[in-house]
Interface confidence: low
C-alpha cells in the first residue's frame, strides 16, 4: 500500500492554544482520532471537509480533531489558552513571503507590483479568463488574492482591476530575502522551514524520517519550533533535518542581516585586558597559551585542522592568532602551533576584578560577620535555625549559635574555603558565598599546618577483591564522554561520585555527558563485559579557584573486579618529596592514529619551592597545588587528560593526590607538572558526599 505522506510539517504549532469562533457563521468539523498527524493529513488533503482547511486543533484529552476554515488571523476568531489543546495553522495561509515560484503561496496580498488592485478570481470583469476556483481545486483561488496556480516563473500574480492591464505579478518577497540572521545564526528564531536546495525541513519534535537527539523538550532554549531552521550546535549557519529520507540534513539559505547587530542580551561584555565570565567577550591580543606556546592562526589549518574559522564564526573576532572563546568553553583558548598539542587555554589572562568594594573575610572566614545572604550561584540562603539538624550531622562540636543569625553567610564548621550557607534547594543543600579573602591576608587556611606532618594515607591496609589486589587494577579511572566522545578523565572516589576538572564541561546540558567505567580502551573495545555506562545527574563545582568538580552519577556504580573506588588523602596532609606517583589518562588527541589505550606516566613528588625554581620562578605555588616531575630526562609529556588523577602510594595505599587541570600542564623534563592538591580540598569533598543526596542502588 502507498505510504501516506506526513504533512504535519506544513503547520505552525502553538502549544496549549485553541481557537474560539466569535462569528457563529464560521463552520467547524470534528472527529475522534489518535494523533495530530492524522488531523494534519486530512486538513492538507481537505478530505471529507466541506471547506478549505486552514488550521486545526488537536484535543489531546479527548483525542479529537477540530478542523477550521479559518486561522488565528481571521476575523471573527480569537485565541484562547487551554492545557489540552494544540493549535496547528497551515503555514501557507500565514506566510507573507514565497518559496521558489510561490506555487504554495496562500497569503492575502491582493495588489500587483505596480500597485493595481487585483480582480477577483471568480469574476470575469474586467478580464475574462479560465482560472476558475472550481477548475483549480486546492490552489486557493479565493477572493482577489495573488496566486500562482501553475507554478510559473515570476511568482504569484493576478488579473488586475485595470481594463488596460490584463495581469501582473505581485511584489511578494522570497522567504530567503525576508529572513536574516546575525553571526552564525545561533540566535536565529525565524520561520524558514526549507533548506537551500528547497527540501522541506523535518519537524524537530518528529523522529521520522531521521532519528535525532535535538528534542524540543530536552533543549527548551534552542527554539525548536515546528520545522524551522535552527543552529543548536555551533554550525556555520542554521540547518535542519530534511523530509528526504536520503538527505539527513542540509543548511538553510538565510542571509546575514544588513546591520549585523546582535540583541543586547546576546552581546558579551567586551574586554581587552582581562576576562569577564568565561571570556566570550575577550577581544585582547594575547596570542600564546598559558605555557608560552604560540597560538595557530584561526584562518590556518596547519598544524591543526578545524572548523573554527573566521568565516564560520563571524561575530567571534577570530583575528590573527589571538586567544578567543568562540564556542562557550571555560575561558579563552586557541589551537597551538605545536603539532602535538591541539588546543590550550590562555589561563594567564587575568580575570577582571569582580570583588572590589565587596565584603571580604580573613583566614577561612570563621569570624566573618557580614550580612551577605546569597550563594555564589545566586540562591538565597535559608535560615540557620531551620538547618541545625543537618549542621550537627557533619560537625562534632556545638556551633556558636550567636554567630548563626538570620540567613547570613557564615563558617560554623571551620570550612577551609570560606563562608557558606544552606539553601532551600534540595539539589544544592548548601554552597559557598561569593566573598573573597581580604587583600593582603596571608593567614593559612589549613589550620593544622603547625602540627606534626600528617600522613596522607589512612592506616588501613590495601583492600583485596576476589583475591586480586586492587592496586594492580585501575578500576577507579573514568572516561567522561561528551556527545558520545571521550573528553576527560576522572576518578571514582565513591560509588556515586567522580572527581574531575571543571574544564571538562563545555555544555551545561547534563544529557550531553556520560561516565564510562571499567574500560581500558577509550572506545570500549574489548571492554564490553566490564564496561559500565552511567548518566550524570549533577555537577558540584569546587570552591572558587579550585578547578575541581564532583560529578554525581545518576545511579551508583557497581563495584566489581573492573570498577573500584580510589581513596582520598587526609585533609591537609603532606606527602614526602620524591614519593613515586603516576598520572593516568587516555591522552586523547583526536588524531586517527591514536590507539585509544589508557596510558600511565611515572612522576615523583617535588616540593613547592623546588618546583617553582624549575619553572624559573614563573609560577608561585600555593597550598592548593601539588607538584610532580618526570622521573627521567627524555620522558615526554605525561599522558594524562584533564580531570585525570595523580595517584600516589603511601603505606601500601593508593590515593588520588592530584587532579590534572589545564593551565598548569603535565610534566616534561625540568618542567614539573602542577596539579590541584586534593588533600587541600578533602574536607570539601567529604562534606559534599555527606550532605548531597545520592540515588540508592
Amino acid at each position: 500500500q502507498r505510504k501516506r505522506r506526513n504533512t504535519i510539517h506544513e503547520f505552525k504549532k502553538s502549544a496549549k492554544t485553541t481557537l474560539i469562533k466569535i462569528d457563529p457563521a464560521l463552520k467547524i468539523k470534528t472527529k475522534k482520532v489518535n494523533t495530530a498527524d492524522q488531523c494534519a493529513n486530512r486538513c492538507t488533503r481537505n478530505k471529507g471537509l466541506p471547506f478549505t482547511c486552514k488550521a486545526f486543533v488537536f484535543d489531546k484529552a479527548r483525542k479529537q480533531c477540530l478542523w477550521f476554515p479559518f486561522n488565528s488571523m481571521s476575523s471573527g476568531v480569537k485565541k484562547e489558552f487551554g492545557h489540552e489543546f494544540d493549535l496547528y495553522e497551515n503555514k501557507d495561509y500565514i506566510r507573507n513571503c514565497i518559496i521558489g515560484k510561490g506555487r504554495s503561496y496562500k497569503g492575502t496580498v491582493s495588489i500587483t507590483k505596480s500597485g493595481i488592485k487585483c480582480q477577483p478570481w471568480s469574476s470575469m470583469i474586467p478580464h475574462e479568463h479560465s482560472f476558475l476556483p472550481s477548475s483549480y481545486r486546492g490552489k486557493d483561488l479565493q477572493e482577489n488574492y495573488c496566486r500562482n496556480p501553475r507554478g510559473e516563473e515570476g511568482g504569484p500574480w493576478c488579473f488586475t482591476s485595470n481594463p488596460e492591464v490584463r495581469y501582473e505579478v505581485c511584489d511578494i518577497p522570497q522567504c530567503s530575502e525576508v529572513e536574516c540572521m546575525t553571526c552564525n545564526g545561533e540566535s536565529y528564531r525565524g520561520l524558514m522551514d526549507h533548506t537551500e536546495s528547497g527540501k522541506i525541513c523535518q519537524r524537530w519534535d518528529h523522529q521520522t524520517p531521521h532519528r535525532h537527539k535535538f528534542l524540543p523538550e530536552r533543549y527548551p532554549d534552542k527554539g525548536f519550533d515546528d520545522n524551522y531552521c535552527r543552529n543548536p550546535d555551533g554550525q556555520p549557519r542554521p540547518w535542519c533535518y530534511t523530509l528526504d529520507p536520503h538527505t539527513r540534513w542540509e543548511y538553510c539559505a538565510i542571509k546575514t542581516c544588513a546591520d549585523n547587530t546582535m540583541n543586547d542580551t546576546d552581546v558579551p561584555l567586551e574586554t581587552t585586558e582581562c576576562i569577564q565570565g568565561q571570556g566570550e567577550g575577550y577581544r585582547g591580543t594575547v596570542n600564546t597559551i598559558w605555557n608560552g606556546i604560540p597560538c595557530q592562526r584561526w584562518d590556518s589549518q596547519y598544524p591543526h585542522e578545524h572548523d573554527m574559522t573566521p568565516e564560520n564564526f563571524k561575530c567571534k573576532d577570530l583575528r590573527e592568532n589571538y586567544c578567543r572563546n568562540p564556542d562557550g568553553s571555560e575561558s579563552p583558548w586557541c589551537f597551538t602551533t605545536d603539532p602535538n598539542i591541539r588546543v590550550g587555554y590562555c589561563s594567564q589572562i587575568p580575570n577582571c576584578d569582580m570583588s572590589h568594594g565587596q565584603d571580604c573575610y580573613r583566614g577561612n572566614g570563621k569570624n566573618y560577620m557580614g550580612n551577605l545572604s546569597q550563594t555564589r550561584s545566586g540562591l538565597t540562603c535559608s535560615m540557620w535555625d531551620k538547618n541545625m539538624e543537618d549542621l550537627h550531622r557533619h560537625i562534632f562540636w556545638e556551633p556558636d549559635a550567636s554567630k548563626l543569625n538570620e540567613n547570613y553567610c557564615r563558617n560554623p564548621d571551620d570550612d577551609a574555603h570560606g563562608p557558606w550557607c544552606y539553601t532551600g534547594n534540595p539539589l544544592i543543600p548548601w554552597d559557598y558565598c561569593p566573598i573573597s579573602r581580604c587583600e593582603g591576608d596571608t593567614t593559612p587556611t589549613i589550620v593544622n599546618l603547625d602540627h606534626p606532618v600528617i600522613s596522607c594515607a589512612k592506616t588501613k591496609q590495601l583492600r583485596v577483591v576476589n583475591g586480586i589486589p586492587t592496586r594492580t587494577n585501575i578500576g577507579w579511572m573514568v572516561s567522561l564522554r561528551y556527545r558520545n566522545k571521550h573528553i576527560c578523565g576522572g576518578s571514582l572516589i565513591k560509588e556515586s561520585w567522580v572527581l574531575t576538572a571543571r574544564q571538562c564541561f563545555p555544555s551545561r546540558d547534563l544529557k550531553d555527558y556520560e561516565a564510562w567505567l571499567g574500560i581500558h580502551d577509550v572506545h570500549g573495545r574489548g571492554d564490553e563485559k566490564c564496561k559500565q555506562v552511567l548518566n550524570v545527574s549533577q555537577l558540584v563545582y569546587g570552591p572558587e579557584g579550585s578547578d575541581l568538580v564532583l560529578m554525581k552519577l545518576a545511579r551508583p556504580a557497581v563495584l566489581d573486579d573492573f570498577v573500584s573506588t580510589i581513596d582520598l588523602p587526609n585533609y591537609g596532609c603532606t606527602i614526602p618529596e620524591k614519593t613515586s606517583c603516576s598520572v593516568y589518562g587516555w591522552g586523547y588527541t583526536g588524531l586517527i592514529n591514536y590507539d585509544g589505550l589508557l596510558r600511565v606516566a611515572h612522576l615523583y613528588i617535588m616540593g613547592n619551592e623546588k618546583c617553582s625554581q624549575h619553572h624559573r620562578g614563573k609560577v608561585t605555588l600555593n597550598e592548593s597545588e601539588i607538584c610532580a616531575g618526570a622521573e627521567k630526562i627524555g620522558s615526554g609529556p605525561c599522558e594524562g587528560d584533564y580531570g585525570g588523577p595523580l595517584v600516589c602510594e603511601q603505606h601500601k595505599m593508593r590515593m588520588v593526590l592530584g587532579v590534572i587541570v589545564p593551565g598548569r600542564g603535565c610534566a616534561i623534563p625540568n618542567r614539573p607538572g602542577i596539579f590541584v592538591r586534593v588533600a587541600y580540598y578533602a574536607k570539601w569533598i567529604h562534606k559534599i558526599i555527606l550532605t548531597y543526596k545520592v540515588p540508592q542502588s
Epitope: 539527513r248 543548511y251 572548523d307 572506545h523 570500549g524 586517527i592 592514529n593 585509544g596
Partner: antibody, heavy 118, light 112 residues
C-alpha cells in the same frame, strides 16, 4: 550524484589521475573516499579526503596514491601504476557525522575502469 | 586486520532466510563501526546497514544487522529475487597511523 572519469589503458609507471565530480554535494560538509575493485574480486579501500582537505590513506596505499580536491571535484592520482592496479575505481561519499561517527560510504559513483598493461 | 565472510556462495529459496557472517581478526575501532553493502553485477555497491544494525535510508526492513566486537551477521528474511547479489561487510580498525577501513571478501547470494 557522484561520477568518476579518467579511467583508461596505461602502461606501467605512467602516472594517471582519476577525477570524481560531485553535484548536489557540498565538499565542505562531506568527506569523500576512493575504493577499488579488481576484476572478479572484492572491494579494497584506498583512502579518503576530509572536509578540510586533509587526505588519509590505507596503510598499503600510502605513497602509491594521492588524493586531492578542488570543489566540485576530488582527484585520485595513481603515482606509478603497476599491473596489480588494474581495477574499477569507485568514488564514494562518506556519511556525515550527524548520522554516525563511523566511516560509512552512503553514495557511490558507477566507477571508472583502469587497465595497466604493457 | 582481516574480515572473513562465510559462507560463499550461499543459496536460498524465495521467501527463505539467508544469514551471512563476518569475522574480524581484531576488535573494531568503535564497537559498532561496521557496515554491510550489496553489489549487483555491473553496479556500484549500495549501503544496506551501518553502525552494525542501523538500516540505511530506503532499505527494506527484511535486512537486519547484528553483532559487535569481532563477530557480525547480516540476515535477510523473506528473501526476494531482487536480493540476488554479492554482499560485502566493512569494518573500521585502528592500525599504525591510520584508521584502517577493511572490506570482507564478499558473499554471493543466489536466489532459487
Amino acid at each position: 550524484s557522484v561520477e568518476e572519469s579518467g579511467g583508461r589503458l596505461v602502461t606501467p609507471g605512467t602516472p594517471l589521475t582519476l577525477t570524481c565530480t560531485v553535484s548536489g554535494i557540498d565538499l565542505s560538509n562531506y568527506a569523500m573516499g576512493w575504493v577499488r575493485q579488481a576484476p572478479g574480486k572484492g572491494l579494497e579501500y584506498i583512502g579518503m579526503i576530509g572536509v578540510n582537505g586533509r587526505a588519509w590513506y590505507a596503510t598499503w596505499a600510502k605513497g602509491r596514491f594521492t588524493i586531492s580536491k578542488t570543489s566540485p571535484t576530488v582527484d585520485l592520482k595513481i603515482t606509478s601504476p603497476t599491473t596489480e592496479d588494474t581495477a574499477t575505481y569507485f568514488c564514494a561519499r562518506l556519511i556525515d557525522e550527524r548520522s554516525t561517527y563511523s566511516y560509512v560510504f552512503d553514495l557511490w559513483g558507477q566507477g571508472t575502469l583502469v587497465t595497466v598493461s604493457s | 586486520q582481516v574480515l572473513t565472510q562465510t559462507p560463499s556462495p550461499v543459496s536460498a529459496a524465495v521467501g527463505g532466510t539467508v544469514t551471512i557472517n563476518c569475522q574480524g581478526s581484531q576488535s573494531l575501532y568503535n564497537n559498532n563501526a561496521f557496515s554491510w553493502y550489496q553489489q549487483k553485477p555491473g553496479q556500484p555497491p549500495k549501503l544496506l546497514i551501518y553502525d552494525a544494525s542501523t538500516l540505511a535510508s530506503g532499505v527494506p526492513s527484511r535486512f537486519k544487522g547484528s553483532g559487535s566486537g569481532t563477530q557480525f551477521t547480516l540476515t535477510i528474511s523473506g528473501v526476494q529475487c531482487a536480493d540476488a547479489a554479492t554482499y560485502y561487510c566493512q569494518g573500521e580498525f585502528s592500525c599504525g597511523d591510520v584508521d584502517c577501513i577493511a572490506f570482507g571478501g564478499g558473499t554471493e547470494v543466489v536466489v532459487k
